[in-house]
Interface confidence: low
């Protein structure tokens, strides 16, 4: 708590300028009257205050507003927005897409941190949906927000947004989310050539159907075991072991300390047993040779 | 910051049930998704279940799906694993976590054991 103390005479600030960073923190807080402060906070942003500069500033706001910060102080709080609290934050009301995304490049190049994580919260609140242009901002900002959206409002990401995607973005994600971001990457990076083309949709395969992995076992990608190991069991099922081999190329004999685990283990159960011998992995639990193989799912089709 | 503190851990037989909870205290208000994971000896870290703070919606892995239920108490910052059916192969340190809307949760408990052994 900065101490109550008169301005010196002739200090009182008349301007939010460079001058007011030769000041001591009590004569900030004696000679610089908050309603300016507010009506100027475009030009904080430009004057290299010290943090402690900055902590003096910001007391003078939480001042004036305690209930919280109009949208047109909030717009121009710059680098003091990282002096806000979340508790702070959630005092606003923040309606604007320039004000978000002016805030967000305060920020930007950092982990989201919790201020940033409750502005949004508060702003996709205070908007009543994600729309896609607020989903555009926030994915190009931040490419791991898309992992703590819901399937249903995935849907509105745009394809463009997935060009900033990288892996390790997509490590929160679950299959649902991945079955909705699969085929927008894969429009996305539909123009790109065999092998950048993997490099890219690699780390959405968790939502690729069995046609896509087919193809790719035609193109020599070598898929590793770790990627193979999060595709869907359902998209795995049918391939063939031919098709496994050239999918992963000489990670295939990665499949052997997978077999108890899905989908490997559930594949393996799908797959004649004397196919699985060509593997030369000592895999186990195939089909026995000589046994009919039924496909209810063709025979319900035709009931 | 936000703490989290599980209980519920121990012993049990194959087929039995075991209740998991979280406690959760700090900065919550904010959180986006509160989950389980778990780690058995030897192994990475293992999603088990996961419910968005928002809206209530859940995922599970197929390992667990059908046997493991979460959900939460809001009023009692509570978070909590229903696991049925179990079996040996979860036994595992049980962990509670939460994270903002951001790509990795980044707030952890200490974990709870469950054995599931005869």
């Known amino acids: 708590e900065v101490e109550k103390t008169a301005c010196p005479s002739g200090k009182k600030a008349r301007e939010i300028d460079e001058s007011l960073i030769f000041y001591k923190k009590w004569e900030l807080e004696a000679c610089v009257d908050a309603a300016l402060l507010a009506t100027q906070m475009d030009r904080v942003n430009a004057i290299p205050f010290t943090y402690e500069q900055l902590d003096v500033l910001k007391h003078k706001l939480d001042e004036l507003y305690p209930q919280g910060y109009p949208e047109s102080v909030i717009q121009h709080l710059g680098y003091l927005f990282l002096k806000m609290s979340p508790e702070d934050i959630r005092k606003w009301n923040v309606t604007s897409l320039e004000t978000l995304k002016a805030l967000l490049e305060v920020n930007k190049g950092h982990e989201m941190s919790p201020q940033v994580a409750t502005l949004i919260d508060r702003f996709v609140k205070g908007r009543g949906q994600l729309d896609k242009d607020t989903l555009d901002t926030l994915t190009a900002f931040y490419p791991g927000y898309l992992c703590s959206l819901s399937p249903e409002e995935l849907s509105s990401v745009p394809p463009s947004s997935i060009w900033a995607v990288r892996p390790q973005d997509l490590d929160t994600c679950d299959p649902r989310q991945l079955d909705v971001l699969y085929p927008k990457a894969r429009l996305a990076f539909q123009n790109m050539n065999g092998s950048e083309y993997f490099v890219k949709i690699q780390s959405f395969l968790g939502g690729a159907p069995t046609e896509d992995l087919k193809a790719l076992s035609q193109q020599n990608v070598s898929m590793d075991l770790a990627t193979f190991m999060k595709l869907r069991t359902d998209a795995v099922l049918p391939l063939t072991v031919a098709e496994v081999q050239k999918l992963l190329g000489p990670h295939v004999e990665g499949l052997k300390a997978e077999e108890r685990h899905r989908p490997v283990r559930d594949w393996i159960l799908r797959q004649r047993q004397d196919d699985l011998d060509t593997l030369g992995l000592g895999l186990q639990g195939g089909i026995p040779n000589g046994y009919l193989v039924l496909d209810l799912s063709m025979q319900e089709a035709l009931s | 910051e936000v703490q989290l503190v599980e209980s519920g851990g121990g012993l049990v037989q194959p087929g039995g049930s075991l209740r998991l909870s979280c406690a959760a205290s700090g900065s919550i208000s904010s959180i986006y998704a509160m989950g389980w994971f778990r780690q058995a000896p030897g192994k990475g870290r293992e999603l088990v279940a996961t419910?968005?703070?928002?809206?209530?919606?859940?995922y599970y892995p197929d390992s667990v799906e059908g046997r493991f239920t979460i959900s939460r108490d809001n009023a009692k910052r509570m978070v909590y694993l229903q696991m049925n059916s179990l079996r040996a192969e979860d036994t595992a340190v049980y962990y509670c976590a939460a994270r903002y809307m951001t790509q990795s949760f980044s707030y952890w408990g200490q974990g709870t054991q469950v054995t599931v052994s005869s």
């Open positions: 419910i968005n703070t928002v809206d209530d919606i859940t």
